[in-house]
């Protein structure tokens, strides 16, 4: 592509499923135009969680993402959400430079497009293309699980990657089951880990200009079944104004496959509790942990009726855990008024 050519996803329609997560490599100075949905009904574009304005050098307008001239700070994750919902129509990452990385090992490589200018680029030392995917350094996984470490990088010339374990070259030859090194995905995969896999894993990314490295620390736990663990303090007591949107968050850790429900406590015939002593609840959301955003409860355009106690309930084959929080809804016209939630802030319980 010449630098004057545009980066464009065609057609300008809601994408097919295989388009939903992509990486696009864009040359500096190149214009970008990406489409999402049909014209007026097009989705809203967000960069790193912030909605793009309809005007400016980088803009989201009538379903289009338009960048006049691609700059290094334009690199990052862009989402297109359907209007009036949280449905993701496009999920893509724009990368500066001419080296492709993968956002998902299981993707069809054909879904990647190299959109960079193929003319001579200045040499560049390796750099991490997705540091947000490398935020977690300390890992502890139950024996038998699969572990995947990734160090997505780029540079010019395209860097090579090699792996060390405890400072020594690591090819997995002494490991039962071996390892999978997917250089095009910058990843190391170990299936069915055992205690002897504990150690410090280092990815070393090098080219003629320089090198970078990153350490992952891996612990392998002997399996000890437990009910789900919920992060303390979540969900958190929240105060909102009528008409606003609220997100309640619940973080769940479970070895065994957990099942999560969001409940709202309700009153029936003037009572909050049934004859069995259990509270009356309404199930708002239910799914397993693999479902998208099950750990978040979205309440849109809240009204006074939405005020009350909400519970995140997580269960697995061993038992149940739940934590609750209060939502206080303030009238629109007097945002200075505050209502005190009950004494107990976020409280939690465990049941076998």
């Amino acid at each position: 592509l010449e630098a004057s050519e545009e980066v464009e996803l065609e057609p300008c329609l809601a994408p097919s499923l295989e388009q939903q997560e992509q990486e696009l490599t864009v040359a500096l100075g190149q214009p970008v135009r990406l489409c999402c949905g049909r014209a007026e009904r097009g989705g809203h574009w967000y960069k790193e969680g912030s909605r793009l304005a309809p005007a400016g050098r980088v803009r989201g307008w009538r379903g289009r993402l338009e960048i006049a001239s691609f700059l290094p700070e334009d690199a990052g994750r862009y989402l297109c959400l359907a209007r009036g919902s949280m449905i993701v129509l496009q999920n893509l990452t724009l990368i500066t430079g001419d080296s492709l990385t993968s956002s998902n090992d299981d993707e069809d490589p054909k879904s990647h497009r190299d959109l960079s200018n193929r003319h001579s680029y200045p040499q560049q030392a390796p750099y991490w293309t997705h540091p947000q995917r490398m935020e977690k350094k300390l890992h502890a996984v139950p024996a038998g699980n699969t572990v995947k470490f990734r160090c997505p990088a780029a540079g010019n010339p395209t860097p090579t990657i090699r792996w060390l374990k405890d400072g020594q070259a690591f090819h997995g030859e002494n490991r039962i089951g071996g390892i999978r090194l997917r250089h095009q995905h910058w990843s190391l995969v170990m299936e069915s880990v055992v205690p002897s896999d504990r150690g410090t894993y280092t990815c070393l990314v090098e080219n003629a200009v320089g090198s970078i490295r990153y350490n992952y620390l891996l612990d392998v736990l002997e399996r000890s079944p437990h009910r789900p663990i919920l992060q303390a303090g979540l969900p958190a007591n929240t105060t909102a104004v009528v008409g606003s949107d609220v997100e309640l968050l619940c973080k769940v850790y479970s070895d065994a496959q957990p099942h999560i429900q969001w409940l709202k406590h309700i009153v029936i015939n003037g009572s909050s509790f049934g004859a069995d002593g259990f509270p009356y609840v309404q199930v708002l959301k239910t799914a397993d942990i693999n479902s998208s955003e099950v750990e978040v409860l979205y309440l849109r355009n809240v009204s006074a009726e939405d005020a009350g106690e909400y519970t995140c309930l997580a269960g697995n084959s061993i038992g149940l855990s739940y934590q609750s929080a209060w939502l206080t809804v303030l009238p629109e016209e007097d945002p200075t008024w505050t209502a005190a939630a009950p004494e107990a802030a976020s409280h939690h319980h465990h049941h076998h």
């Epitope: 935020e135 350094k137 300390l138 502890a140 504990r198 490295r213 350490n215 891996l218 736990l221 002997e222």
Partner: antibody, heavy 120, light 112 residues
Amino acid sequence: EVQLLESGGGLVQPGGSLRLSCAASGFTFSHYWMGWVRQAPGKGLEWVSVISPSGGLTIYADSVKGRFTISRDNSKNTLYLQMNSLRAEDTAVYYCARSSGWALDAFDIWGQGTMVTVSS
Amino acid sequence: QYELTQPPSASGTPGQRVTISCSGSSSNIGSNIVHWYQQLPGTAPKLLIYGNNQRPSGVPDRFSVSKSGSSASLAISGLQSEDEADYYCASWDDSLKAFYVFGTGTKVTVLG
């Protein structure tokens, strides 16, 4: 309440040994990476060591490698630091701390510290 | 001891904005999340902020952070007397020398 409580500090001669303990409560100790951080009088913080949840992986700062040993007893919810061949420069308040995945591996809970003085 | 570099002191009057810098290298801040700790006089350190402005419960949003390349900074807006403390940046380190490094520490003084 989530809490860490260190003990075992005191005065010891150069070349001597000391064993620090850290009792954890209010959380599932066996699920967390734990560490020791020290602070010499009037100085800044220095990371000393970290240990994995199972105890099978330990990492040390160069300044204590070969002299200090970090360990844990998950059945007793207790973290230890065995300090041998102590030197004057090991004089510090020693804090035990929990590293949390929820907080992107930061040390989110700290004990109140125990003072170790190495002097003849 | 391998450290991140911070200014030894910073000060401001109540209500002012104070910024603390933290300079590291590609092996620590350049590749890793930055953590910030606050140590009030005579007490143990406490986690103040981490990552992209994530705070433990109870930490006011007057505290904010930013990161660029191998440097980071902590900003305290609307400075209050209770903010007088030592502040430390920290990061995991991928060099062969250290695994977790703290900054040299910055003493924040609230004037008048």
